[in-house]
């Protein structure tokens, strides 16, 4: 006498499940269950999710909608897509910033903060890969600049300064004494 048998709902269409006393049709995405149906294979009473709440899937049992997430301003996040009745807010980074995950195994739901992208131009370097999901990848020095240490140094404008080997190769002339 376990009472664990869950009778199959034999209704036209497959989106029926026993809720309350009968097999009822579930609520569509963006709606919550106000009251179950009161007849076999009937329609539940479903209401639209109130503002700032959502339900992304068809559901049988949700009697309230989930609260929309607020993007974390402290982490410099912005809303890429506003919350709707059927989808949560999509948070991301504004143009010129990239996502830095706060956990090592990064998935779409992982906590993150936004970091400003490197400005390759300000470093006098070519932009090899634009910043989006990761930081900008800067390439070689721009014309008129040569590699020196970790940075790009401007080619000398006169012949008075010393121009090392690399400078000469890039800047196009060798310093003569």
């Amino acid at each position: 006498q376990g009472g664990t048998r869950s009778p199959r709902c034999d209704c036209a269409g497959d989106f029926h499940k026993k809720i309350g006393l009968f097999c009822c049709r579930g609520c569509p995405a963006g709606h919550y269950l106000k009251a179950p149906c009161t007849e076999p294979c009937g329609n539940s009473t479903c209401l639209v999710c109130p503002q700032d709440t959502f339900l992304a899937w068809e559901n049988h049992h949700n009697s309230e909608c989930a609260r929309c997430q607020a993007c974390d301003e402290q982490a410099s996040q912005v809303a890429l897509e506003n919350c709707s009745a059927v989808a949560d807010t999509r948070c991301g980074c504004k143009p010129g910033w990239f996502v830095e995950c706060q956990v090592s195994q990064c998935v779409s739901s992982s906590p993150f903060y936004c970091q400003p992208c490197l400005d390759c131009g300000a470093l006098h370097r070519h932009t090899r890969l634009l910043c989006s999901r990761r930081d900008t990848d800067c390439g070689t020095c721009l014309p008129g600049f040569y590699e020196h240490g970790d940075g790009c140094v401007s080619c000398p404008t006169s012949t008075l300064g010393s121009c090392p080997e690399r400078c000469a190769a890039v800047c196009g002339w060798r310093q003569m004494f």
């Epitope: 376990g2 009472g3 009778p7 034999d10 209704c11 809720i19 006393l21 009161t38 076999p40 049992h61």
Partner: antibody, heavy 120, light 111 residues
Framework: EVKLVESGGGLVKPGGSLKLSCSAS????????MSWVRQTPEKRLEWVAA???????FYPDSLKGRFTISRDNARNTLYLQMSSLGSEDTALYCC??????????????WGQGTSVTVSS | DIVLAQSPASLLVSLGQRATISCRAS??????????MHWYQQKPGQPPKLLIY???NLESGVPARFSGSGSGTDFTLNIHPVEEEDAATYYC?????????FGAGTMLELK
């Protein structure tokens, strides 16, 4: 063995209140939908309220607001709180278990009932 | 609300004969391929006992001399051959919608 034992009935004055209990044993109470059904002195059966295993309550419109069904799964007990009682509520009140093979309300076990008399 | 009219109100049948009880609903209780009509037996001093569910399905432990038929608005409970222990009041009940309602009952007496 499935057993349903009602209690709490008695004589009550018009306008009064009463709370009935139904103690269940011999089955996994929390997995079953349960109902209260009353039998009038004329032997008519009237469905009074139901409480589904997933937590929903149901009443006929005529009794909504006056009667409240509740359940305590830890105590294996079904309750019926009745208020603003009138002579038309005089009956034998039975609790009944809904069949677990059914996704519609049909009652496969009934208690013996507890008698409620509303009279001044 | 769906009203269930049972007939006759009482029935006198000889042992071994057939008893036929009718239940007529004020609107169809059939939908989605099923007829949501059920039958109960109540003996004096006892609670009702489920006999038949969904118009024609015999509840476990109920003797095969009980049978049910019908669809839409008209349903029948048959007992054949009637035995002494079948003297009781028989009720139909629908679960086509809420509220659930019962017929007024048919009292079966033996000659």
């Amino acid at each position: 063995e499935v057993k349903l034992v009602e209690s709490g009935g008695g004589l009550v004055k018009p306008g009064g209140s009463l709370k009935l209990s139904c103690s269940a044993s011999g089955f996994a109470f929390s997995n079953y939908d349960m109902s209260w059904v009353r039998q009038t002195p004329e032997k008519r059966l009237e469905w009074v309220a139901a409480f589904s295993s997933d937590g929903y309550t149901f009443y006929p419109d005529s009794l909504k607001g006056r009667f409240t069904i509740s359940r305590d799964n830890a105590r294996n007990t079904l309750y019926l709180q009745m208020s603003s009682l009138g002579s038309e509520d005089t009956a034998l009140y039975c609790c009944a278990r809904h069949a677990d093979y059914a996704n519609y309300p049909v009652m496969d076990y009934w208690g013996q009932g507890t008698s409620v008399t509303v009279s001044s | 609300d769906i009203v269930l009219a049972q007939s006759p109100a009482s029935l006198l049948v000889s042992l071994g004969q057939r008893a036929t009880i009718s239940c007529r609903a004020s609107k169809s209780v059939s939908t989605s391929g099923y007829s949501y009509m059920h039958w109960y037996q109540q003996k004096p001093g006892q609670p009702p006992k489920l006999l038949i569910y969904l118009a024609s399905n015999l509840e476990s432990g109920v003797p095969a001399r009980f049978s049910g038929s019908g669809s839409g608005t008209d349903f029948t409970l048959n007992i054949h051959p009637v035995e002494e222990e079948d003297a009781a009041t028989y009720y139909c009940q629908h679960s086509r919608e809420l509220p659930l309602t019962f017929g007024a009952g048919t009292m079966l007496e033996l000659k």
